[in-house]
């Protein structure tokens, strides 16, 4: 077995895409290696190449399908191995059995959008992008917005428990420039994380109204 | 904590497969990771299989060749070995061990990672 300074992870994105990361100090960085998935009751197979993402890392996709087909289930269960070359033969560095819905990483939301827009609040919009229609409506939200003079990792984070694919946000200041991002999680899974931030949303809240005189 | 019985050793003709299980009692059996170590006569106590607590994933000896598959039931309180396949460089004593840590899955883990062990179960493979 290889030495505890290797690491194997592993996401499925619930859909199609199993996306991995294999670190291990010490391995030449331009080793050729590369992840096979076999899973245990499906006729396909299917290989990506590591390819560096720092000094002693490597990452890679395996493209299981179509974006939006589902590729595996609840029950199935992926046999995972990093094969490296060695001379002319390839040698087996790591094996793991993998299942899917309990390494749920989603893609990041997208086509996030106004809906409407005042002086203290803003209503926005977003939607989920390649998630199995399995979770129904099983899914939490996480938000945050950016607002001037703070960074994103100043910015509170706002948990919305249940499928919701919008949010209003209040007390907002007046003729002020924010940005907005959102991520999502399924509910189910042992190791299932957030997905990506979204892209930032930019938006300006409408200035107040000028007072009249009375 | 946890005690550990394997049972399901013996002997056994080579190509065939063997199913090895690890009974749990005394504790919370899905709060722990577990492992299946083997040691052959004369040789060091050898990494096997280690499988989450909840059994998202199960890491595999390379020597292992894909032969063999661990399972656990948090249900019954039991790990389980697979092993198809046999060779005779299989024989040894199969041993069921407990981590209290947290296990990720992601890594090969030492058997000093491993807290509590069972008594072990001997299997033979005969050419």
């Known amino acids: 077995a290889v030495n505890g300074t290797s690491q194997f992870t592993c996401f499925y994105n619930s859909r199609a895409n199993i996306s991995c990361v294999w670190s291990q100090d010490g391995a030449l960085q331009d080793t050729s290696c590369q992840v096979h998935a076999w899973p245990d009751r499906r006729r396909w197979n299917q290989t990506c190449e590591l390819l560096p993402v720092s000094q002693a890392s490597w990452a890679c996709n395996l493209i299981l399908g179509a974006p939006d087909s589902q590729k595996l289930t609840t029950v199935d269960i992926v046999t995972l191995r990093v094969l490296c070359r060695e001379g002319v033969r390839w040698r087996v560095m790591a094996i793991q059995d993998f299942k899917p819905f309990e390494n749920l990483r989603l893609m990041a939301p997208i086509s996030l959008q106004v809906v409407h827009v005042e002086t203290h609040r803003c209503n926005i919009s977003w939607e989920i992008s390649q998630a199995s229609h399995y979770f129904e409506r099983h899914l939490e939200f996480e938000a945050r917005t950016l607002s001037p003079g703070h960074t994103w990792e100043e910015a509170p984070l706002l948990t919305l428990k249940q499928k919701q694919e919008w949010i209003c946000l209040e007390t907002l200041t007046p003729d002020t420039q924010y940005e907005f991002q959102v991520r999502v999680k399924p509910l189910q899974g042992e190791f299932t994380t957030w997905s990506p931030w979204s892209q930032p949303l930019a938006f300006r809240t409408k200035p107040a109204a000028l007072g009249k005189d009375t | 904590q946890v005690q550990l019985v394997e049972s399901g050793g013996g002997l056994v003709q080579a190509g065939g497969p063997l199913r090895l299980s690890c009974a749990a009692s005394g504790g919370t059996f899905s709060s722990y990771a577990m492992g299946w170590f083997r040691q052959a006569p004369g040789k060091e106590r050898e990494f096997v299989a280690a499988t989450t607590r909840g059994g998202g994933r199960t890491m595999y000896a390379v020597s292992t060749e894909g032969r063999f598959t661990c399972s656990r039931d948090n249900a019954k309180n039991t790990v389980y070995l697979l092993m198809n396949s046999l060779k005779p460089e299989d024989t040894a004593v199969y041993y069921c061990?407990?981590?209290?840590?947290?296990?990720?899955?992601?890594?090969?883990?030492?058997?000093?990672?491993?807290?509590?062990w069972g008594q072990g179960t001997q299997v033979t493979v005969s050419s």
């Open positions: 061990a407990a981590m209290t840590s947290y296990y990720s899955g992601t890594y090969y883990p030492d058997s000093s990672d491993f807290d509590i």
